[in-house]
């Protein structure tokens, strides 16, 4: 057993261009806190996977308000160390995740809000009992400087905290086969304490609390002989005399994994895959309980009242993640139809619909022509969420109420003069042009470049546009 200790030295903008904006402002003061998550081995697991070696949250740092115009300085930090106790041996190699969180203290609805500013991760080798190791990690434009160490809790000593030390019983020397405990020369290494009940003849241990079996013996306490009677199972090495060895109960028989862990056999023993919130050889240890306040953004911690039960966070609408740490971008799913504008109000989604559409998701196409009349013989045409009128000749406007001036748009080309006529308009073309809109030049030989003039009309005559 022992404690992993993390000391944050600074968190601020990293070197180089593109310094980040301060996470706090006069309008939105904030303070920082940190979370550390430890996992055994050099794993590259997802950030959401269990912190099997343990996790810890720091206290909140001092409230910080940005000075307008000033560059983002190193931000004020919480006091004290982050301490992650570990119950079993220190693994020597470990992976870490250190998260920097911002607690916004502005007067926003819902009180303080939490958001993840930066997350750094790494894999390291570290012997317990050694000096502080210094580290610098960058996350985007931010830089985190920190130190860490692992130390054993008495009576454990050694690089893995597996050797036990006891005060000397005799003043001069340690007992038979036991060495003095460096650096505590006045103490003696104690014999390893195997798991209670572990067979002294057929079992042994390399770490406190374990029980490993000598060949030919099995079971959690190495008290069950390996049967050689017949070959009923493929388990065990083959033998020339018996054909094979069939163990009695397998290491996973009776499921030694607590708290819903699943057991799988390994060449030498078994391995438990633990549910979230549990770790240890048999999933018997819980890293985080509801008392640690693992749920952010108003999440409610359910279960996890003690180290023997996993917690879950029930997240308020708009947040998700195992700790309610992720804001849900519900508008990214484009829930508003027919070009509606999506608004995420936190507690609910709203769609602001374009004209002519309605419904919670703008899914209803309104009957644009319902109750709308087009004047002067016009007919209503639906389309695109808005009604329009197709007006009778000589009328215009949204509802065909305006008498149209057919010449207002200057329809006659090449200097032709426009005359309003009861059935439309007439263009009087300039010399050299012809057509309903005076659009065709007349060739010098008198023939038109495009359609011939209708019978009875000479080039240059006024062209009535019907």
């Amino acid at each position: 057993a022992g404690v992993f200790e993390l000391q944050i030295h600074s968190f601020g903008p990293g070197p180089g261009p593109g310094a980040p904006r301060s996470p706090c402002s006069a309008r939105l003061p904030c303070r920082l806190f940190f979370r550390v998550c430890l996992k055994p081995g050099l794993s590259e697991e997802a950030a959401e996977s269990p912190c099997a070696l343990g996790a810890a949250l720091s206290a909140r740092g001092p409230v910080y308000t940005e000075q307008p115009g000033a560059p983002a300085p190193d931000l004020p930090l919480p006091d004290g160390l982050l301490q992650v106790p570990f119950r079993d041996a220190w693994p020597g190699t470990f992976s870490f995740i250190i998260e920097t969180w911002r607690e916004e203290l502005g007067d926003q609805i819902g009180g303080p809000a939490w958001s993840l500013l930066a997350r750094v991760a790494g894999r390291r080798r570290l012997a317990a009992g050694g000096p502080w190791a210094r580290d610098i990690q960058r996350a985007g434009a931010w830089e985190l400087r920190f130190s860490y160490r692992a130390r054993c809790e008495p009576p454990a000593v050694g690089t893995a905290c597996t050797r036990l030390c006891r005060p000397r019983s005799a003043p001069s020397r340690c007992g038979p086969g036991l060495r003095p405990c460096a650096p505590l020369e006045d103490e003696c290494e104690a014999p390893l304490v195997c798991r209670a009940g572990c067979s002294p003849e057929h079992g042994f241990c390399e770490q406190p609390g374990e029980c490993r079996c000598l060949e030919g013996w099995t079971g959690p306490l190495c008290t069950v002989p390996v049967s050689t009677s017949s070959c009923l199972s493929p388990r065990g090495p083959s033998s020339a005399t018996t054909g094979c060895l069939v163990p009695g109960p397998g290491p996973c028989d009776g499921n030694p994994c607590a708290n819903g862990g699943s057991c799988s056999e390994t060449p030498r023993s078994f391995e438990c895959t633990c549910p979230r919130g549990f770790y240890g050889l048999r999933c018997e240890v819980s890293g985080v309980t509801c008392a640690d306040g693992p749920c952010f953004n108003g999440g409610l911690c359910v279960g996890g009242a003690d180290p023997d039960s996993a917690y879950i966070c029930h997240c308020p609408p708009g947040f998700q993640g195992s700790n309610c740490e992720k804001r849900v971008d519900r508008c990214s799913l484009q829930p508003c139809r027919n070009g509606g504008l999506c608004l995420d109000l936190g507690h609910a989604l709203r769609c602001r619909c374009r004209a002519g559409f309605a419904g919670p998701r703008c899914e209803h196409d309104l009957d644009d022509c319902a109750g709308r009349a087009c004047a002067n013989g016009g007919t209503c045409v639906e389309g695109g969420g808005a009604h329009r009128c197709s007006c009778a000749l000589g009328f215009g406007g949204r509802d065909c109420r305006e008498r149209a001036d057919p010449c207002a748009a200057r329809p006659c080309a090449h200097g032709g003069r426009c005359y309003a006529h009861f059935s439309g308009l007439v263009c009087a073309c300039a010399p050299g042009y012809m057509g309903a809109r005076c659009e065709f030049p007349v060739h010098p030989d008198g023939a038109s470049a495009l359609p011939a003039a209708p019978p009875g009309l000479r080039p240059g005559d006024p062209q009535r546009y019907l």
């Epitope: 609805i109 819902g110 009180g111 303080p112 509801c290 008392a291 640690d292 306040g293 952010f296 108003g298 409610l300 911690c301 359910v302 279960g303 996890g304 009242a305 029930h314 308020p316 609408p317 708009g318 936190g346 507690h347 609910a348 919670p360």
Partner: antibody, heavy 118, light 108 residues
Amino acid sequence: QVQLQESGPGLVKPSETLSLTCTVSGASISSFYWSWIRQPPGKCLEWIGYIYYSGTTNYNPSLKSRVTISVDTSKNQFSLKLSSVTAADTAVYYCARIAVAGFFFDYWGQGTLVTVSS
Amino acid sequence: EIVLTQSPGTLSLSPGERATLSCRASQSVNKNYLAWYQQKPGQAPRLLIYGASSRATGIPDRFSGSGSGTDFTLTISRLEPEDFAVYYCQQYDRSPLTFGCGTKVEIK
């Protein structure tokens, strides 16, 4: 304006099941968690449980074996069933909306008194 | 579960006086997830404060909340006639959600 209205019988016989419905107006039932709370005459408030439209529920361990909360999004209603009632279940039963900022109660119904008596 | 103990049970004061109500938790309430409610006879409770110190919409500024960890306080700076009621605290840090048993503020 958000309004909640409890409805159901005011008198239930011992060992029977108490059934109440809360009708919500002014808010979509799909956007919030919804809860039941009770208060025996002259006594403290006791949280019974809550539900989210997705079906997520959470009940007070002291009542868990007897409580079922359900939701009907089409009617914008949620309901409470409490089985095997005794005189100790006599109380004013409130339905309430759980706030967005956390699991506290920002809107309450006016409450309905349920008496357990033969 | 977190047990909330409110004190005093009854507070006898006159209009215009300052009222200080206490709510003590059996375990630390993380992130100040604590709310205060006011209840008048025959009515449902009404939310006053959440997050230990944030006033709910429409609540007058004579009501203020403070505290953290296990000790929380509701203060009414100058009692108005309509403030005489029972006040409850509630934690929403972890399940089960729990209420205190109330402090009655009565006219002296």
